[in-house]
Interface confidence: low
């Protein structure tokens, strides 16, 4: 049996005045909940969204038929106001109301924190009709409650476009502390203060925080969440975590490593990618950055030569990319190369030194005493020269390149000849008569082609002219020679 409930309810007129022929009844008494005489279960809606709680209100129904009495105000019956339970437990709560049978199509909706609960929640409304009233019980169940189910739940009933609202039922889901902020890994300067933050929430509150450093609690007494730990400074790496305690137990944050910034480790794997006569392209693998970003690197170059003074050339470069082209080197020379990088703390040691060599260079001087003369009988131009005095770095002479340019009546044609290193003379066929032939010679090594000699010009007359006078490289400072025949 369902017992009668009498409670104080503040009248809340739904309608502007009494209906014709109605009698007014005691507004303060609620209708009793009738004995169960049958029910019509109807599935309702549900779960969870946040918002604001509503305060309950009542409706004062009136009756139409002549001689009938004024009905009492409608209000949800008081129910449990606060339910506390642990996470993952099941909960069921309800609200009930007795509605005069004159009202049709009464529906009850559930609201959480001011938002209607729609969807496949376990909300069931049961109707227990009697002669004059129908008792309506709306129940709401949640299986395996979570923190997100915390909130204020109310029932709403709509009658004649007016709302009746139940008192709120506060659901408090308790569990282990839940971290909202955990300490973060940091890289700090030695002996410099820094802060770590830890925050956790219940319910239940309060949540107390213990800090742990390298497996030892930092604070002997707990601090109420949130907690800021000021570490005055470290001289070596430390691992920090925080423990959050409440009446349900303990939750431990992730452990975070606080690293001490240090000079970087030296770069490794210095590699030669390309060598030319005067440059070397290197790369390296950066060492450990010492928990502080690299700023720049220094490439150190020493010439490996017993006769060199052992001085070190230093080339500064950005830390990225890990590559540098060393320039202004001597040809055919051996070098020892090391790399060092720096961060805000300082320079790393130098990487292991590696040996590298530049390749042969091109000759730096042109062949000497170039002479040119016409051998008319063979229709050839004879060219003679002296081997240049090349430096060792230029490498071994492999030959000569002869450039001869033929100019006649606005037409110019350049031809190139290659001759072996053992030669100091060459013959070239006359290409054009009645023309000027300009000859230049360059020495060639594996390192490349050296500079060309100063041009020597010879005029090639029309057929039948004879002149054996040579044209030759002028003495330094003289104008280009031209032999006119």
């Amino acid at each position: 049996a369902i017992t009668e409930a009498r409670e104080e309810a503040k009248p809340y007129p739904l309608f502007p005045g009494p209906l014709p022929g109605s009698l007014q009844t005691d507004h303060t008494s609620l209708l009793s909940l009738p004995h169960t005489s049958g029910y019509q279960p109807a599935l309702m809606f549900s779960p969870t969204q946040p918002g604001r709680p509503y305060t309950g209100n009542v409706a004062i129904p009136r009756v139409t038929s002549a001689g009938s009495k004024l009905l009492p105000p409608l209000a949800f019956k008081h129910t449990v106001g606060h339910i506390i339970l642990s996470e993952h437990k099941d909960v069921k709560f309800n609200c009930s109301i007795s509605v005069p049978n004159i009202y049709q199509d009464t529906t009850i909706s559930w609201w959480k924190d001011g938002k209607e609960l729609l969807g496949a929640h376990h909300a069931i409304t049961q109707f227990y009709p009697d002669d004059e009233v129908t008792a309506i019980i709306a129940s709401f169940s949640i299986t395996s409650v979570q923190r997100s189910d915390n909130g204020s739940y109310i029932c709403k009933m709509k009658i004649n476009n007016e709302e009746i609202v139940s008192d709120p039922i506060y659901i408090e889901v308790q569990g282990l502390p839940h971290f909202t902020k955990q300490p973060e890994s940091m890289n700090v300067t030695r002996n410099t203060a820094f802060n770590l933050t830890c925050q956790a929430v219940g319910p239940p509150e309060p949540v107390n925080i213990f800090w742990v450093q390298n497996s030892s609690r930092v604070n002997e007494q707990p601090e109420k969440s949130p907690s800021v730990l000021t570490v005055p400074g470290l001289t070596e790496m430390a691992v920090f975590s925080c423990e959050a305690h409440n009446d349900k137990g303990l939750t431990v944050s992730k452990g975070v490593q606080i690293n001490i910034k240090a000079i970087p480790s030296p770069p490794t794997e210095v590699s030669i990618h390309n060598s030319t006569a005067h440059s070397i392209l290197i790369s390296w693998v950066p060492g450990f950055d010492g928990y502080s970003p690299f700023r720049n690197c220094s490439v150190q170059v020493k010439e490996v030569d017993p006769l060199s003074n052992g001085s070190v050339m230093i080339f500064n470069t950005s830390a990225s990319p890990h590559m540098y082209q060393i320039k202004q080197l001597q040809a055919l020379a051996n070098y020892s190369i090391g790399v060092s990088c720096m961060n805000e703390i300082g320079w790393s040691a130098v990487s292991p030194w590696i040996l590298a060599s530049t390749t042969e260079g091109a000759p730096s001087v042109a062949p000497l005493n170039v002479t040119v003369f016409l051998n008319e009988s063979r229709d050839n131009v004879d060219i003679r020269w002296m081997k240049p005095l090349t430096k060792r770095q230029a490498g071994e002479l492999v030959g000569y390149r002869i450039s001869h340019v033929w100019q006649s009546a606005g037409i110019s044609k350049e031809l190139l000849e290659e001759v072996g290193q053992n030669n100091s003379r060459a013959q070239i066929s006359v290409q054009v008569h009645n023309a000027t032939c300009t000859v230049r010679i360059a020495a060639v090594t594996k390192g490349g082609v050296g500079p060309f000699s100063d041009p020597v010009k010879i005029f090639i007359p029309a057929h039948g002219w004879v002149d054996h006078a040579p044209s030759s490289t002028p003495a330094p400072g003289n104008a280009d020679p031209v032999l006119i025949i």
Epitope: F210, N214, S215, S216, R217, V218, E220, V239, S241, E243, H245, G249, L250, V252, K254, G255, Q257
Partner: antibody, heavy 117, light 108 residues
Framework: QVQLVQSGAEVKKPGASVKVSCKTS????????MYWVRQAPGQGLEWMGI????????TYAQKFQGRVTMTRDTSTSTVYMELSSLRSEDTAVYYC??????????WGQGTTVTVSS | EIVLTQSPGTLSLSPGERATLSCRAS???????LAWYQQKPGQAPRLLIY???SRATGIPDRFSGSGSGTDFTLTISRLEPEDFAVYYC?????????FGQGTKVEIK
């Protein structure tokens, strides 16, 4: 609540290595520092080192440095302590222990390691 | 490393008597991070006191810890038959963690 279950007794020859396991049950997330302590027959407790399972940070007592290695296998919630170059004086009961909550200390049942030729 | 010296080495007492065990550190123990353990033959140690004076869960209130800095004391106000065992102090304020050599409380 956390329980620590250690591997069974071992008999080893001098110079050999021993690897003792310590499996966490109850709370399979090993989130706490794990300590290893040993006790030679009739002697006191001797701290060997700590393993922080979250970050594999280890701290070893100077006496065992270079001979002891503490590791973990998260997939099986097991911590290991390996001691190499065993000598007769390493004969002892080896315990793993952890602080599960700030007010609680949990110990394994101990593993007897006997070093004998 | 911090050396812990326990005294006396052996304490012979009767049930109902008061036991006072001392633990002295060679240097100050950080934040009084000192624990007391009880060990019975064939068993693992059992934590009694942490933080020099806080009783661990489930430890009877006849056990109490006191002291700070370098001098610490474990007191058993009235010895029960099950209290006869070896007691160790341990500092956990710095690495390496170190134990005292132990005090044996035996029945007189």
């Amino acid at each position: 609540q956390v329980q620590l279950v250690q591997s069974g007794a071992e008999v080893k020859k001098p110079g050999a290595s021993v690897k003792v396991s310590c499996k966490t049950s109850g709370n399979t997330q090993i989130r706490y520092y794990m300590y290893w302590v040993r006790q030679a027959p009739g002697q006191g407790l001797e701290w060997m080192g700590i393993l922080n399972p979250n970050q594999d940070q280890t701290t070893y007592a100077q006496k065992f440095q270079g001979r002891v290695t503490m590791t973990r296998d998260t997939s099986t919630s097991t911590v290991y302590m390996e001691l190499s170059s065993l000598r007769s004086e390493d004969t002892a009961v080896y315990y793993c222990a952890t602080t599960y909550r700030y007010y609680m200390d949990v110990w394994g049942q101990g593993t007897t390691v006997t070093v004998s030729s | 490393e911090i050396v812990l010296t326990q005294s006396p080495g052996t304490l012979s007492l009767s049930p109902g008597e008061r036991a006072t065990l001392s633990c002295r550190a060679s240097q100050s123990v950080r934040s009084n991070y000192l624990a007391w353990y009880q060990q019975k033959p064939g068993q693992a140690p059992r934590l009694l006191i942490y933080g020099a004076s806080s009783r661990a869960t489930g430890i009877p209130d006849r056990f109490s810890g006191s002291g700070s800095g370098t001098d610490f004391t474990l007191t058993i106000s009235r010895l029960e038959p099950e209290d006869f065992a070896v007691y160790y102090c341990q500092q956990y304020g710095s690495s390496p963690r170190t134990f005292g050599q132990g005090t044996k409380v035996e029945i007189k």
